[in-house]
Amino acid sequence: AWELTILHTNDVHSRLEQTSEDSSKCVNASRCMGGVARLFTKVQQIRRAEPNVLLLDAGDQYQGTIWFTVYKGAEVAHFMNALRYDAMALGNHEFDNGVEGLIEPLLKEAKFPILSANIKAKGPLASQISGLYLPYKVLPVGDEVVGIVGYTSKETPFLSNPGTNLVFEDEITALQPEVDKLKTLNVNKIIALGHSGFEMDKLIAQKVRGVDVVVGGHSNTFLYTGNPPSKEVPAGKYPFIVTSDDGRKVPVVQAYAFGKYLGYLKIEFDERGNVISSHGNPILLNSSIPEDPSIKADINKWRIKLDNYSTQELGKTIVYLDGSSQSCRFRECNMGNLICDAMINNNLRHTDEMFWNHVSMCILNGGGIRSPIDERNNGTITWENLAAVLPFGGTFDLVQLKGSTLKKAFEHSVHRYGQSTGEFLQVGGIHVVYDLSRKPGDRVVKLDVLCTKCRVPSYDPLKMDEVYKVILPNFLANGGDGFQMIKDELLRHDSGDQDINVVSTYISKMKVIYPAVEGRIKFSTGSH
């Protein structure tokens, strides 16, 4: 028998520095977690103790903090190289800055193979990107070899900016021939490493003949055997065992997100490459694990540029940006409109001639807007200003909801109106009218939404049975501020870009902004 240790991360989302327990900015260092310096310590400890170790990443290193905003992926290559990652799969967020923003900082600089079997380049891009990412790679480990095949969510064109010269194929269809090729090369230990979410990971384990282990990402799935060490609630045991269609037991793993855990899976193979046993658990990277001093010093060196960036002007406002709780928790506020407009703008994807865009709607809890921005400071808007407005380090995500769920959400928005509570919704691509004289749960008297399948966008009444795409904060997608109906009834959820980054990019693009209060939210006469 031959034993392999798989160390794995996924959805790190630019958390190069240690974070608080909820993966936001580290405040009290003695209670902070994760970060590449701490990850390095644990990886080094395991590599020194065990003979056959692979360190893998299942995608979405890009996007999530000011590190990515400033360094645009160069930081990913630099620190992953320093940790000596063995392979990485492409995630959807790796395309956030377009294909060039993937090629130059990451694909050309990474010392490790970057993989995806279901992304096919065409046209002029095919020769430019040739060899920079691969469908699979065979890695020597000790005296054996292990094949790694990559895959990426086929929804990436809707979630990011891969352009028109990359085709995202069905994962299972694309993986099978590559695994077959590895088998003909006498590679009998094969790991599928990818970024399509836990449901697809399980399908790959079930359907792709020859895959021995699946290491996934995208859905931020936390698996654990035994008592979990932090706040995350396990979605199942680690590893999650899937019985394949050909009768094999295939371990499937994921390691939550944000570099908070290091996945740790031990696999025992027989001489024919069959999995005999698998066991392990994610390792919580808490403060009991010291940060490596040399990596930490490197982080501090790179950090200097971030501090300079946060005070630079992104753009100007010529109007007061009203982000006060007195406004945003009671009525339409122009800060809410600005943020929602930025959220929609960030999700412009012209992928189909039938649709002007795939999504037109935004909702945003008023309680998530934490500060106004005064235009009387020469109109200057900085990252620092935006960090005061959006201090929680969240993301603006894409969900699919039925009209009936949206109606419930808007009823919840005003079910206890007047108490300055955070659930009052700011909107984009939506016109809502409330009648507060009616009883809670029946206060939405008009709800019109902007069409997407149209050449001239216009507002139509919401249809209860129709499925709509909506951009919203991850906080709401996870049921925050009492929006349990969104969490319980959403049909799809894909995590998006860092909130501050979305707004800062929009302001930089527009250069001068002047958002107005324009009648998106109204109260019917006599009730307000």
Epitope: R84, E109, K111, Y136
Partner: antibody, heavy 121, light 111 residues
Framework: QVQLVQSGAEVKKSGSSVKVSCKAS????????ISWVRQAPGQGLEWMGR????????NYAQKFQGRVTITADESTSIAYMELSSLRSEDTAMYYC??????????????WGQGTMVTVSS | QAVLTQPSSVSGAPGQRVTISCTGT?????????IHWYQQLPGTAPKLLMY???RRPSGVPDRFSGSKSGTSASLTITGLQVEDEADYYC???????????FGGGTKLTVL
């Protein structure tokens, strides 16, 4: 950018051992792999083995297994290659080499100046 | 006997184009292990010329290019110059040998 500076030439008796050093300066020594490659007079290059100092992991070419030992001292940024049971065929230029800043772990961007080891009977 | 096979010598006149082949097997190039190329001028240490089949380190002129097909790789030099006269080596991993291997080397003579 890292530079590799090797110890001086050695003349050794057949059956003895030689230990060649390779000092890294001007970069992060420990995160790179250090390989040892030799070249007999008028012959081609031959990979002997490597070490990743941060992990202490080593790989050796089958031909040299049991006869070569590669070690590294992170505190001094020095890698060592010791070859035992020397014979005349071991007379060669011995190079240490590293990936450095190039985007591949196993490509040798940075080379030491070489250490000539002569084995006399 | 080297695991990767290279012609022992090639030659060309200044300005011409020459190609050096590196033939392997399914246990090295055929498996997709990277090929790197080195140039060794007389009396000096080797210099990395091309890595991962087609990529040039900074400072290497674009007259040098690499390619791969099946179990073979090749290095092409266009617009040959006198200073290109040197020995050239390919390198890969070999799963049978369980280690990194070099080709036997090719002596390029500029006529």
């Amino acid at each position: 950018q890292v530079q590799l500076v090797q110890s001086g030439a050695e003349v050794k008796k057949s059956g003895s051992s030689v230990k060649v050093s390779c000092k890294a300066s001007g970069g992060t020594f420990s995160s790179y792999a250090i390989s040892w490659v030799r070249q007999a007079p008028g012959q081609g290059l031959e990979w002997m083995g490597r070490i990743i100092p941060i992990f202490g992991t080593t790989n050796y070419a089958q031909k040299f297994q049991g006869r070569v030992t590669i070690t590294a001292d992170e505190s001094t940024s020095i890698a060592y290659m010791e070859l035992s049971s020397l014979r005349s065929e071991d007379t060669a230029m011995y190079y240490c080499a590293s990936d450095g800043a190039v985007a591949a772990y196993d490509a040798f961007l940075i080379w030491g100046q070489g250490t000539m080891v002569t084995v006399s009977s | 006997q080297a695991v990767l096979t290279q012609p022992s010598s090639v030659s060309g006149a200044p300005g011409q184009r020459v190609t050096i082949s590196c033939t392997g097997t399914s246990s090295n190039i055929g498996t997709g292990y990277d090929i790197h190329w080195y140039q060794q001028l007389p009396g000096t240490a080797p210099k990395l010329l091309m890595y991962r089949f087609t990529r040039r380190p900074s400072g290497v002129p674009d007259r040098f290019s690499g390619s791969k097909s099946g179990t073979s790789a090749s290095l092409t030099i266009t617009g040959l110059q006198v200073e290109d006269e040197a020995d050239y080596y390919c390198q890969s991993y070999d799963s049978g040998q369980r280690g990194w291997v070099f080709g036997g080397g090719t002596k390029l003579t500029v006529l």
